[in-house]
């Protein structure tokens, strides 16, 4: 049974091969139960976590994970060497940097060791599943009386990342956002000196090195300007 799965994890074009034993209709077996989907994310190309929902099993089961890379020099089947656990049941596998090959098709297989025929295999494009660390060291410089420049750093190659800057004043109901390319720099041309501004940034592995849809966590916020909270009617709503 070959199924195309549409998942919101950057692998919308990924095919998954599910190998389920067909059983006679009069004898329902555990091997007919679908295995949980495996979700993998590569964190800053330092390590990868592949996890599944262990609580979806009808009874606690230590599922096992194997992986390999399709049509490559790394096509030898590997056992997971570092399991992640949830309430003493396997719920994931962590792969280290040396085991990650972003640009080869990653094949991951989940198996029920008590029912070896009960297994599911997925193929993933890891370059679409990279999540960088949050931007760091946000700094603000005044370029002129009314112009601010925001700079930040990332712990990855600059050209591989794009960024999203959000800012708002204490008077704003919502964030204003601006996309920024690899240059990790943002200018706000018109700043009101009477208001206090908050800025934050997140980053994504896209588009030159990958096609990831997931953003990093937001950076720690950085503030600029007067704290006008005493006269600010929206402050408490914003902080609630």
């Amino acid at each position: 049974l070959n199924t195309t799965i549409l998942t919101p994890n950057g692998n919308e074009d990924t095919t998954a091969d599910f190998f389920l034993t067909t059983m006679p209709t009069d004898s329902l077996s555990v091997s007919t139960l679908p295995l949980p989907e495996v979700q993998c994310f590569v964190f800053n190309v330092e390590y990868m976590n592949c996890t599944w929902n262990s609580s979806s099993e009808p009874q606690p089961t230590n599922l096992t994970l194997h992986y390999w890379y399709k049509n490559s020099d790394n096509d030898k089947v590997q056992k997971c060497s570092h399991y992640l656990f949830s309430e003493e049941i396997t719920s994931g596998c962590q792969l280290q940097k040396k085991e990650i090959h972003l640009y080869q098709t990653f094949v991951v297989q989940l198996q029920d060791p008590r029912e070896p025929r009960r297994q599911a295999t997925q193929m993933l494009k890891l370059q679409n599943l990279v999540i960088p660390w949050a931007p760091e060291n946000l700094t603000l410089h005044k370029l002129s009386e009314s112009q601010l420049e925001l700079n930040w750093n990332n712990r990855f190659l600059n050209h591989c990342l794009e960024h999203l800057v959000q800012y708002r004043t204490d008077w704003d109901h919502s964030w204003t956002e601006q996309s920024v390319d690899y240059r990790h720099k943002f200018s706000l041309p018109s700043v009101d000196g009477q208001k206090r501004y908050t800025f934050r940034v997140r980053s994504r592995f896209n588009p030159l090195c990958g096609s990831a849809q997931h953003w990093s966590e937001w950076s720690h916020p950085i503030h600029w300007g007067s704290n006008t909270s005493k006269e600010n009617p929206f402050l408490f709503a914003l902080e609630a």
């Epitope: 190309v45 090959h101 972003l102 640009y103 588009p207 030159l208 090195c209 990958g210």
Partner: nanobody
Framework: QVQLQESGGGLVQAGGSLRLSCAAS????????MGWYRQAPGKERELVAG???????YYADSVKGRFTISRDNAKNTVYLQMNSLKPEDTAVYYC????????????????WGQGTQVTVSS
């Protein structure tokens, strides 16, 4: 058959200009990105400029404001316009297609050209 074909290299005086071209087959050109790398003797290959299918461009700090990357979708060709050339721009320039990451064992490139020599004399 050659999948990426560079041309336009040569010998030029400092301050001069060259335009490199890289012709690709249609399926390659439709990939995620195209880029220009260079490699000087005894140095590692470095990304000079890149352009994604959607138009996003990248320039190394050392060439910003002097080099311009562009693509002609009708001709399946990517160009590198190099102005105000310096002796330190001397290298073999390679065209690449795929994802533009060549770092710590990760290689996103599907295709490389054979390279074209650029020599800038002082």
């Amino acid at each position: 058959q050659v999948q990426l074909q560079e041309s336009g290299g040569g010998l030029v005086q400092a301050g001069g200009s060259l335009r490199l071209s890289c012709a690709a087959s249609g399926s390659i050109f439709a990939g995620p990105a195209m880029g220009w790398y260079r490699q000087a003797p005894g140095k590692e290959r470095e990304l000079v400029a890149g352009i994604a299918t959607g138009g996003t461009t990248y320039y190394a700090d050392s060439v910003k404001g002097r080099f311009t990357i562009s693509r002609d979708n009708a001709k399946n060709t990517v160009y590198l316009q190099m102005n105000s050339l310096k002796p330190e721009d001397t290298a073999v320039y390679y065209c690449a297609a795929g994802y533009l990451l060549l770092w710590e064992g990760q290689d996103g490139h599907d295709y490389w050209g054979q390279g074209t020599q650029v020599t800038v004399s002082s």
